[in-house]
């Protein structure tokens, strides 16, 4: 494979976060080459001496893959020709967090870029009215978080109000002994108001909104990854 080693090509990565137990993507793009057989993709992880993944001559070459990644990686083979070297990581583990290098060799030269990959657990919260309680109460539940997040309540009517005195948050360890279920209860809820339950750790921020009126209940949730352009 004859490259001079003197020319450099542009390689671009994007910091991202992986949700433990689910599949994740490590994003990497590069200046494409005309021939697939001339492209080599190598994914490396800081402190790991074996390769995370290697793709060359149009197919995966996994003989040098490190044990901790065996059977868990794949590139998007049909997109390599257009400059996509992104890596799919199956069943994300807490220990997958770290700095990765996307290293590319083509007939034009070689290049690399690093990316920070965070791992944790994050999930959408669901806010419901707790009809079993003695007073009007809201219950915010999110099934999987790690590391332990903070939970803050807010309301549209009482903007800036501190609800810590009238709320109670608990964290229950899930069966796999890493992630936790988050349950937060807000008391003394008034009608015709929109309440927000905001759950946040250093990886993600999720919000569950509930609007309670005489005639209906409206819910909305959204989740945003932090320190990530993904």
């Amino acid at each position: 494979f004859g490259i001079s080693g003197r020319h450099s090509i542009t390689v671009t990565t994007v910091a991202s976060a992986g949700n433990i137990g689910e599949d994740g993507i490590l994003s990497c793009t590069f200046e494409p080459d005309i021939k697939l057989s001339d492209i080599v993709i190598q994914w490396l992880k800081e402190g790991v001496l074996g390769l995370v993944h290697e793709f060359k001559e149009g197919k995966d070459e996994l003989s040098e893959q490190d044990e901790m990644f065996r059977g868990r990686t794949a590139v998007f083979a049909d997109q390599v020709i257009v400059g996509n070297a992104s890596l799919r990581l199956k069943n994300v583990q807490l220990t997958d967090a770290g700095t990765y290098k996307c290293y590319i060799i083509t007939s034009k030269g070689k290049g690399n870029a690093n990316l920070e990959y965070k791992t944790g657990a994050f999930s959408m919260p669901e806010v419901n009215v707790d009809y079993n309680a003695s007073s009007e109460t809201l219950r915010c539940e999110a099934p999987r978080w790690f590391p332990q997040p903070t939970v803050v309540w807010a309301s549209q009517v009482d903007q800036g109000a501190n609800f810590s005195e009238v709320s109670n948050t608990s964290f229950e360890l899930n069966s796999e002994n890493v992630t936790m279920k988050v349950v937060s209860v807000l008391y003394n809820v008034t009608i015709n108001n929109t309440y927000s339950c905001m759950i946040e750790n250093d990886i993600a921020k999720a919000t569950g909104d509930i609007k309670v009126t005489e005639s209906e209940i409206k819910r909305r949730s959204h989740l945003q990854l932090l320190n990530s352009k993904a």
């Epitope: 494979f1 080599v40 490396l44 800081e46 402190g47 001496l49 901790m68 290293y103």
Partner: antibody
Amino acid sequence: EVQLLESGGGLVQPGGSLRLSCAASGFTFNTHAMHWVRQAPGKGLEWVSAISGSGGSTYYADSVKGRFTISRDISKNTLYLQMNSLRAEDTAVYYCARLLGRFGEYGMDVWGQGTTVTVSS
Amino acid sequence: DIQMTQSPSSLSASVGDRVTITCRASRSIYTWLAWYQQKPGKAPKLLIYDASTLQSGVPSRFSGSGSGTDFTLTISSLQPEDFATYYCQQSYSTPYTFGGGTKVEIK
């Protein structure tokens, strides 16, 4: 100053054990993979073992697999090589070395002075 | 395992000579190759990494080239302190392997 200092070598009988230590100073120990390399008298260099920065991954040459164990104590900035079931062919100067760069694709840029292990009855 | 074959095993040269040492890998290692210098009773010293990158503090008379399976270490003008044994080493695949060494002696 970046430095590695090995100790623990000596004379041991075949079948015996030794533990080599390598004290690191002058750099952030837990961000570098570390290696043990040996050199038998009058011979070339032979890679023996390596450990990742976190200590979570270890690697061995076939000639020592199952007999040698590499480990690191980040709190003490020290690398270890536990050598069991020693053989005459393990006689060598043992060097610890730091991996240059963060990803394993470069060479070993800092070496200790070496410690001598002699296996003989 | 990847075999690293170095040649020649020894050579005699004079101060000021241009010296070339070659290293061949049994299969492609891209540019995952380092060159070391070792003097008697001393630890090896890193000269070149990534096949062609000069390690900090190493004189510019040393240079490395090659990729894939064939690599070269060149000393453009041999100096008295350069008489030593030189080793190549691949870090593409564990077990990492060294070449057998090339002893550069005074003619």
